[in-house]
């Protein structure tokens, strides 16, 4: 009678995470009697996966009908595979012994590789906002994928970026891997509507890459430009002075009028208009009663934008007999109705 052989026909098996792995094993003889056991790994630290004789192995089912009296098929199925299940599995025949069964013969082993999809890339930008012309860093992270090979690309508004660094960890063998990439992006004034995209391609994704996005609106701060103008007289002895706050982002803005250095009024931007590029415009006006002044008046529009140091623009209002001749005649936008008489 030929000596029993344990045959594992598959050198390797590749399974997607969440699926079921089938590990094949047959014996060439019923004799000697004793259980088949499946192990992951070899040597003293090997992990018992299934014991034909006893034990409870909820994830494991046998392929063949074990009630067959001449069963020599000891193939198993392992359900709900995760990357942690990767490794080499050995089908081992034991010979009955007293008090314990004795290892008799092992199959050559089957390497189980698990294909696991990367997690959705998470893109994060800088903690603080930055202004145009500055370079900011964005990071992209994705985890839990296997095998290790992966491709990561960065885009800004569909244009591929080249200034980035990527690491895949760990460097050595692992059940699953993570990718971390940092890209540098130069901000422009037009970036309020811009997006930075991190794109991850992996064999498990079947040509349909995963994308993570960050809106530059969360990152950029566009400081306003100010223009103070004197409008035509509305009535005798009254001058309308406007402060046009243009091209700012985000909307958080506080404006203060100063008359000869003294605070006249403070207001918060409310009814703003949005430009095509996503920035905002706002206008505030001040009605000045010139008859109350004997000297020239210095009017200052002071703007604090998004918690930054205030910027200001001043306008000298000359007190003379013909105030309506002074200043520019820029038409006022009907975006504010903040009138104030100064007495």
């Amino acid at each position: 009678e030929e000596e029993l052989q344990v045959i594992q026909p598959d050198k390797s098996v590749l399974v997607a995470a969440g699926e079921t792995a089938t590990l094949r094993c047959t014996a060439t003889s019923l004799i000697p009697v004793g259980p088949i056991q499946w192990f992951r790994g070899a040597g003293p630290g090997r992990e018992l996966i299934y014991n034909q004789k006893e034990g409870h192995f909820p994830r494991v089912t046998t392929v063949s009908d074990l009630t067959k009296r001449n069963n020599m098929d000891f193939s198993i199925r392992i359900g709900n595979i995760t990357p942690a299940d990767a490794g080499t599995y050995y089908c081992v025949k034991f010979r009955k012994g007293s008090p314990d069964d004795v290892e008799f013969k092992s199959g050559a082993g089957t390497e189980l590789s698990v294909r696991a999809k990367p997690s959705a890339p998470v893109v994060s930008g800088p903690a603080a906002r930055a202004t145009p012309q500055h370079t900011v860093s964005f990071t992209c992270e994705s985890h839990g994928f296997s095998p290790r090979d992966i491709t990561l690309k960065w885009f800004k508004n569909g244009n591929e970026l080249s200034d980035f660094q990527t690491n895949v960890d760990p460097v050595g063998e692992s059940v699953s891997y993570s990718i971390h990439s940092t890209a540098k992006v130069v901000l422009t004034r037009e970036d309020v509507h811009s997006q930075v995209i991190c794109e991850v391609a992996h064999v498990t994704l079947q040509g349909d890459p995963l994308r993570g996005t960050a809106n530059l609106s969360e990152t950029i701060r566009v400081p306003p430009t100010l223009e103070v103008t004197q409008q035509p007289v509305r009535a005798e002895n009254q001058v309308n002075v406007t402060c046009q706050v243009r091209k700012f982002y985000p909307q958080r803005l506080q404006l203060t009028w100063l008359e000869n250095g003294n605070v006249s009024r403070t207001e918060t931007a409310s009814t703003v208009t949005e430009n095509k590029d996503g920035t905002y415009n706002w206008m505030s006006w001040l009605l000045v009663n010139v008859s109350a002044h004997r000297d020239d008046v210095k009017l200052t529009c002071q703007v604090e934008h998004d918690g930054q140091p205030a910027v200001s623009k001043s306008h000298d209002l000359k007190v003379s007999a013909h105030p309506k001749e002074q200043g520019s005649n820029t038409a006022a936008e009907n975006t504010g109705s903040n009138e104030r008489n100064i007495y």
């Epitope: 000697p32 009697v33 067959k68 009296r69």
Partner: antibody
Framework: EVQLLESGGGLVQPGGSLRLSCAAS????????MSWVRQAPGKGLEWVSA????????YYADSVKGRFTISRDNSKSTLYLQMNSLRAEDTAVYYC?????????????WGQGTLVTVSS | SYELTQPPSVSVSPGQTASITCSGD??????ACWYQQKPGQSPVLVIY???KRPSGIPERFSGSNSGNTATLTISGTQAMDEADYYC?????????FGGGTKLTVL
């Protein structure tokens, strides 16, 4: 409590046929292989036939191969033995026996037996 | 085909130890089972996988198996143990029984 109850035995002429039944209860019938074992008067036990839990695999002793057919109806928890071309040497008490499980099972439960007499 | 050989009869005095042997080629490489059958009754499993006792079987029943011989041992034999005993190789598609041994308690 596991119970196996054979029926269908009786007197039959040589060359005749008989169908034995074994009604099982007290266990999940489809999870176990089942066998027929016979014992001629004053003789020892002789295994006749076996069938796997699903019914997909059957086994026969050389002495009955081609004449006897084992089957099972798991929905009725019943085991059958169709015996054709009966001979005098088939005269015996026929026991239905349950396999003890999937790991080198013994016959852990037996029925009370049904007598088959083949005589002219 | 595989064959198992048992002595036709074994006698023992009450309280003594009875040993019933079962021989077969390399039987020690297989699992032996033992059945007890009293007159007019169905067989009852007393030992399986060489040494294991089903629940309800008294501790005086024990088994061993090595080389070419399996042995059923009944220590402190009682009158109620008088019966026919059959060995079986519990590992093949065809269940082979020994010829049986009649145990007589004198």
């Amino acid at each position: 409590e596991v119970q196996l109850l054979e029926s269908g035995g009786g007197l039959v002429q040589p060359g005749g046929s008989l169908r034995l039944s074994c009604a099982a209860s007290g266990f999940t019938f489809s999870s176990y292989a089942m066998s027929w074992v016979r014992q001629a008067p004053g003789k020892g036990l002789e295994w006749v036939s076996a069938i796997s839990g699903s019914g997909g695999d059957t086994y026969y002793a050389d002495s009955v191969k081609g004449r006897f057919t084992i089957s099972r109806d798991n929905s009725k928890s019943t085991l059958y033995l169709q015996m054709n071309s009966l001979r005098a040497e088939d005269t015996a008490v026929y026991y239905c026996a349950k396999d003890g499980g999937s790991y080198y099972p013994p016959f852990d439960y037996w029925g009370q037996g049904t007598l088959v007499t083949v005589s002219s | 085909s595989y064959e198992l050989t048992q002595p036709p009869s074994v006698s023992v005095s009450p309280g003594q130890t009875a040993s019933i042997t079962c021989s077969g080629d390399k039987l020690g490489d297989r699992y032996a089972c033992w059945y007890q059958q009293k007159p007019g009754q169905s067989p009852v499993l007393v030992i399986y996988q060489d040494t294991k006792r089903p629940s309800g079987i008294p501790e005086r029943f024990s088994g061993s198996n090595s080389g070419n011989t399996a042995t059923l041992t009944i220590s402190g034999t009682q009158a109620m143990d008088e019966a026919d005993y059959y060995c079986q190789a519990c590992d093949s598609s065809t269940a082979v029984f020994g010829g049986g041994t009649k145990l007589t308690v004198l």
